[in-house]
């Protein structure tokens, strides 16, 4: 492929190395104010400099009070562990006036067998062990303090759940002689959701567990749980709710089959079914009893789960995913594009579409990308004229007090919000594309005709003129 | 000083064994997963085979499977290959090298040891 | 297995100029906001030393005219400004899975 231009998207670097200010103390919680940003959509600029302005006048002007980061926490029940036997944590940043939680699930694969677990331990450890996590993250994404990054609930109390189990959130079985790890990702959640009721999680109005790639499914298949464990413990007021970000898989076919070896090779099904019986995986209730004993890897999967869920979820999905395309067999690089594979994505998409058309909150762009919510740029991408943090924010409101009962949404506050133009990257807005050499934004057009897209062959298919398909992708429709 | 020194190389005819070894000091051995790699001469790097850090799990190149054996002694802090049936296009600097156990990089690698296989 | 392509094959740069040299995968080698492909110096008669780990991280002891960038598939090494003792063989390699594939090196000659 040499000569050939490369593409590169912006995002998925390491994070920066860790800073380690002490976190400001807590204190007692104050109620926060509600703020309605419908009222200031036509001049978004100058609200965000009142309200960084009006930020910054309440709090005490200290760097140490203006920290950024989540400080970490290892949970004081030392049982519950990462895959190696050291204890699981989170990292927290608190926001004394608010009473909004964001639990976030990080994401990471998965390992189903005592080898690709071995070999993700010398490769992956900090995927498996808090032995070397740093005391402090910045938050970024939706996990951001910054309103100008994180517009939707900037104010909020963030939690960042490192993923440490590799067990798709799922596991419930402790080390012991007979098993080299520990898979405890369920029992994970439940101890922090615990450990934090004690940190003002108590006083909660919204817990919103969030989550990307195996942690959005992680959200699938804890949401509800946290429900009934608030509910046990007597705060049945806590709203819980979920947000899904990249998890949302199909147990399609591959496009080329291949044998189930290593993690990114294996089929979704074929890995499921192996973890589950190696995690001694759990799955929600309602779902479990839909299919019969050995079957439960089908709720693993969001459109399998999802219609039996009780607590409401937004799902953000690219229609593209690159982890799907990934176990899929798919692989958009080196050689052109072969039409086989472009049948196969457009039908993916159009998949992936079906399972989100009963799906009240839902974001899915048309591009080729995975993971948004803790990316900086995720308030960027639109969705027919609306972005992530909008439509989050439109889903909020749906469940004030005025409209208990209503599931469908307010007028322009979109929710429900899924591309249908059929190619990756056909949507303007999707993350850039740069050309590798010279650093040049390239349109959809020369994306894919740079991946060896044939406009002839692609514009008989669709039954319309070459110039006129041409004309169509770099507007972006 | 962090470091690992191969041994045991040398000349040997085709179907003929040679046992190389790595010995590796100050950093604790038992933490890494550790591979060896050779490299022909004038050609590029090629991975060998692979030892989990707790010894559970090994993986070999195609190449050499079923033919070469991956060991590793804890307590000696030692890393050996144990080669049969050599071939003349096992003929290579043959290198041993440290895993990252956070990325999977390879930080540390050793001087090399030359291993020729001819009549 | 994960191929690297990596190119050019060979490059001829001035001193004080800009090497870039670029390696992409089969398939994508990043998850959870980690890129697993790192990079590698080789001079004759001596064993790879790491310079790049995890797509754009600096080995420590490792000057900083060397950068490296990229994420998915798409990865580049960038010497900034080119020194003499630059010349060497460089390779990236991928720790997505088993095996840990190396490019096949892209050879560096200083004009």
């Known amino acids: 492929s040499e000569g050939r231009k490369t593409w590169r998207r912006r995002g998925q670097q390491p994070p920066p190395p860790p800073r380690t200010e002490a976190a400001p103390a807590a204190g007692q919680p104050v109620e926060s104010f509600p703020l309605d940003f419908t009222a200031v959509e036509g001049n978004m600029d100058s609200f965000m400099a009142q309200v960084k302005s009006l930020a910054q006048s309440l709090y005490p002007c200290s760097a140490q009070q203006l920290n950024e980061d989540l400080r970490l926490h290892l949970l004081l029940n030392t049982s519950v562990t990462c895959n190696d036997g050291s204890p699981a944590g989170y990292y927290l940043k608190e926001s004394r006036g608010s009473r909004r939680w964001l639990l976030f699930l990080e994401g990471g694969w998965y390992c189903f067998n005592r080898e690709n677990c071995d070999s993700r331990y010398d490769t992956m450890r900090r995927l498996m062990s808090s032995r070397d996590w740093p005391r402090t993250r910045t938050g970024t994404g939706i996990l951001s303090s910054q309103p100008e990054e994180n517009p939707y609930w900037w104010n909020a109390n963030m939690v960042f759940i490192p993923y440490c189990s590799s067990d798709v959130w799922s596991g419930a079985s402790s080390k012991s002689e007979k098993n080299e790890y520990a898979f405890m990702g369920a029992l994970i959640i439940q101890e922090v959701v615990r450990e934090l009721l004690g940190r003002g999680l108590s006083g909660a109005k919204v817990l919103l567990l969030a989550g990307s790639s195996a942690g959005g499914t992680g959200v699938l298949l804890n949401v509800d749980r946290v429900a009934e464990q608030l509910e046990k413990l007597g705060y049945p007021a806590i709203q819980v709710r979920g947000l899904a970000d990249s998890g949302w898989f199909l147990d399609n076919k591959q496009y080329r089959r291949s044998d189930c070896i290593d993690t990114i090779n294996c089929a979704p099904t074929d890995a499921i079914r192996r973890g589950i019986r190696y995690w001694s995986g759990m799955v929600p209730e309602r779902c479990q009893r839909q299919f019969k004993e050995g079957e439960e890897w089908n709720c693993f999967f969001g459109y399998k789960v999802y219609p039996t869920l009780r607590c409401p979820v937004f799902v953000v999905q690219w229609l593209f995913d690159e982890a799907q395309l990934t176990v899929d067999n798919v692989h958009l690089t080196g050689q052109p594009v072969q039409e086989g594979q472009w049948l196969y994505i457009q039908n993916l998409g159009r998949e992936l579409r079906g399972t989100l058309k009963d799906v009240q909150a839902s974001f899915a762009p048309a591009c080729l990308s995975h993971e948004i919510i803790i990316r900086s740029y995720w308030t960027d991408v639109q969705v027919k004229g609306t972005s992530l943090p909008r439509a989050l924010h439109c889903w909020d409101r749906s469940f004030h007090d005025s409209h208990k009962a209503s599931k469908t949404p307010m007028k322009g506050c979109p929710f429900h919000l899924v591309d249908s133009c059929p190619w990756p990257h056909c949507n303007p807005s999707c993350p850039t594309i740069r050309d590798q050499f010279t650093g040049q934004e390239m349109n959809v057009a020369q994306f894919l005709m740079h991946m060896g897209f044939d406009v002839q062959t692609v514009a008989q298919q669709q039954g319309m003129e070459p110039s006129k398909l041409l004309g169509m992708l770099s507007n972006g429709n | 000083e962090v470091q690992l020194v191969e041994s045991g190389g040398g000349l040997v005819k085709p179907g003929g064994s040679l046992k190389l070894s790595c010995a590796a000091s100050?950093?604790?051995?038992?933490?890494?997963?550790m591979h060896w790699f050779r490299q022909a001469p004038e050609k590029g790097l090629e991975w060998v085979a692979y030892i989990s850090s707790g010894s559970r799990t090994v993986y070999y190149a195609d190449t050499v499977k079923g033919r070469f054996t991956i060991s590793r002694d804890n307590a000696k802090n030692t890393l050996s290959l144990q080669m049969t049936s050599l071939r003349s296009e096992d003929t290579a600097m043959y290198y041993c090298?440290?895993?990252?156990?956070?990325?999977?990089?390879?930080?540390?690698w050793g001087t090399g040891t030359t291993v020729t296989v001819s009549s | 297995d994960i191929v690297l392509t990596q190119s050019p094959a060979s490059l001829a740069v001035s001193l004080g100029q800009r090497a870039t040299i670029s390696c992409r995968a089969s398939?994508?080698?990043?998850?959870?906001?980690?890129?697993?492909m790192h990079w590698y110096q080789q001079k004759p008669g001596q064993p790879p030393k790491l310079l790049i780990y995890l797509a754009s991280n600096l080995e420590s002891g490792v000057p900083a005219r060397f950068s490296g960038s990229g994420s998915g598939t798409d990865f580049t090494l960038n010497i900034h400004p080119v020194e003499e003792e630059d010349a060497a063989t460089y390779y990236c390699?991928?720790?997505?899975?088993?095996?840990?594939?190396f490019g096949s090196g892209t050879k560096l000659e200083i004009k």
């Open positions: 390699q991928h720790s997505r899975e088993l095996p840990p594939t």
């Open positions: 100050g950093f604790t051995f038992s933490d890494y997963g």
């Open positions: 090298a440290r895993k990252h156990y956070n990325g999977g990089y390879f930080d540390v």
């Open positions: 398939k994508i080698v990043s998850t959870s906001g980690y890129s697993y």
